[in-house]
């Protein structure tokens, strides 16, 4: 089996649809399977067509998390198997743009996932770069939240608070509604005190390219780039 057209990597916005193409040939005509982060693809639709010993497979995905997608073409000639692989990464453009570019509005949090974490009647920043900011941000939290089910009892509440306060940032109302980022110190506390082991595992896997964790890419800010609580009492949100 030989791959003629490998799937292409994409950097897309959260909630986009992406179609990955994989074309292979061989005698006999190979079969194509798709793998997502090392496992069989759990969601998405696959369409295939065969023409002149060439198989074309299209995997359509609704993107809610980053991933490594591998196209595997296999055929069997007698007792001998022949396999060809090609991979593509789907990464998500960071939802939270630099503050000066932020366009959005302040509103009370009305979602469910962060109910126990965010203060009652919390005023949060909703990002209008989404068609439906409330739904998109809630879905973003929900997707990352599922990953937190496997972390330690010490890490989980801290990571949940970080996640909710990062995606639904405190909002400072005014002529230009402004999101208030989490203080660097709280981010570091989660990274180094509460979730040290989990963070190390996550970063190691990311470096090795095994998978791109949604917790890492979407919900965890880069601590060093956040404002410090020692700058100004209003520079950031103390959790």
């Amino acid at each position: 089996a030989r791959i003629l057209r490998a799937p292409e990597s994409h950097n897309v916005t959260f909630g986009s649809f992406v179609t990955l193409h994989c074309t292979a040939t061989g005698i006999p005509v190979p079969t194509i399977t798709w793998i997502e982060n090392g496992n069989a693809v759990s969601s998405g639709s696959i369409q295939e067509s065969v023409k002149d010993r060439v198989i074309d497979s299209r995997l359509q995905l609704f993107i809610t998390k980053p991933g490594l997608y591998t196209c595997i073409a296999t055929n069997k000639h007698g007792e001998k198997f022949s396999t060809a692989k090609a991979a593509a990464t789907i990464s998500i453009a960071e939802w939270s743009k630099p503050q000066k570019d932020n366009k959005g509005y302040c509103a009370q949090y009305r979602g469910e996932v962060c109910n126990a974490v965010l203060a009652k009647d919390a005023l949060v920043f909703l990002n209008t770069s989404y068609a439906d900011p409330e739904e998109a941000q809630e879905l973003l939290v929900h997707t990352a939240w599922n990953e937190l089910k496997v972390v330690s009892p010490v890490c989980r509440p801290a990571a949940e608070a970080l996640l909710c306060n990062h995606i639904f940032q405190e909002c400072s109302p005014g002529v230009v509604p402004t999101p208030i980022p989490i203080c660097r110190e709280y981010c570091l506390a989660v990274k180094e005190l509460f979730c040290a082991k989990e963070w190390l595992v996550m970063e190691e896997k990311t470096h090795r390219g095994l998978y791109r964790s949604e917790m890492h890419l979407l919900s965890v800010p880069e601590c060093s780039k956040l404002p410090s609580m020692h700058w100004d009492p209003t520079a950031c949100a103390r959790l």
């Epitope: 203060a119 405190e170 110190e185 709280y186 570091l188 506390a189 180094e192 005190l193 060093s224 410090s228 609580m229 020692h230 700058w231 100004d232 009492p233 949100a237 103390r238 959790l239």
Partner: antibody, heavy 118, light 112 residues
């Protein structure tokens, strides 16, 4: 075990320069702010300023701005407090302390006694 | 700057009796997260200061439970339920709400 070890006592003359040190160990030195606190003989504690060794960002108390310089060398996990021209009124015990991620000073050095006398 | 005012400045106590130190700030130390950015430290004779209470009411690791912190906004209290001889020293409150961080003048606790 988290430790902050300060350099030894110093006796100087007015007008001389001085740099005292505070070496951190047992934790991620670049992730925590280090503060300096002055205690003049028989007096209370005064917060002088802080440094974030990760990027050498500093914040000074207005009372000490321009009087001292706070710096750090993250490669050797050490923070410094220095004077370019000492005065008799700089005679004091100087403590370095680590600001926890919640702001409080959770670990303190043993203190460096600086005596400035002609 | 936020001014921290402690009282009394001197506190003679009989061992086994309770003791209370007050600390008042010129501005509220209560943050939107519900925490008061007020800490208490004890400096024993000839030693470096040590953390007793952080964020208004949380006892630091290794601090005996006879020590407790309370209060909110601008008025705070450190209580020792039963004073022991080892509790002698100078007690300081400190605000970490905004820089420059400031300490109270200190309260000297001595045994009667």
């Amino acid at each position: 075990e988290v430790q902050l070890v300060q350099s030894g006592a110093e006796v100087k003359k007015p007008g001389e320069s001085l740099k005292i040190s505070c070496k951190g160990s047992g934790y991620s030195f670049t992730s925590y702010w280090i503060g300096w606190v002055r205690q003049m003989p028989g007096k209370g504690l005064e917060w002088m300023g802080i440094i974030y060794p990760g990027d050498s960002d500093t914040r000074y108390s207005p009372s000490f701005q321009g009087q001292v310089t706070i710096s750090a060398d993250k490669s050797i996990s050490t923070a410094y407090l220095q004077w370019s021209s000492l005065k008799a009124s700089d005679t004091a015990m100087y403590y370095c302390a680590r600001h926890s991620h919640w702001g409080f000073l959770d670990y303190w050095g043993q203190g460096t006694l600086v005596t400035v006398s002609s | 700057d936020i001014v921290m005012t402690q009282s009394p400045l001197s506190l003679p106590v009989i061992p086994g009796e309770p003791a209370s130190i007050s600390c008042r700030s010129s501005q509220s130390l209560l943050q939107s997260n519900g925490y008061n950015y007020l800490d208490w430290y004890l400096q024993k004779p000839g030693q470096s200061p040590q953390l007793l209470i952080y964020l208004g009411s949380n006892r630091a690791s290794g601090v005996p439970d006879r020590f407790s912190g309370s209060g909110s906004g601008t008025d705070f209290t450190l209580k020792i339920s039963r004073v022991e001889a080892e509790d002698v020293g100078v007690y300081y409150c400190m605000q970490v709400q905004q820089t420059p961080y400031t300490f109270g003048q200190g309260t000297k606790l001595e045994i009667k």
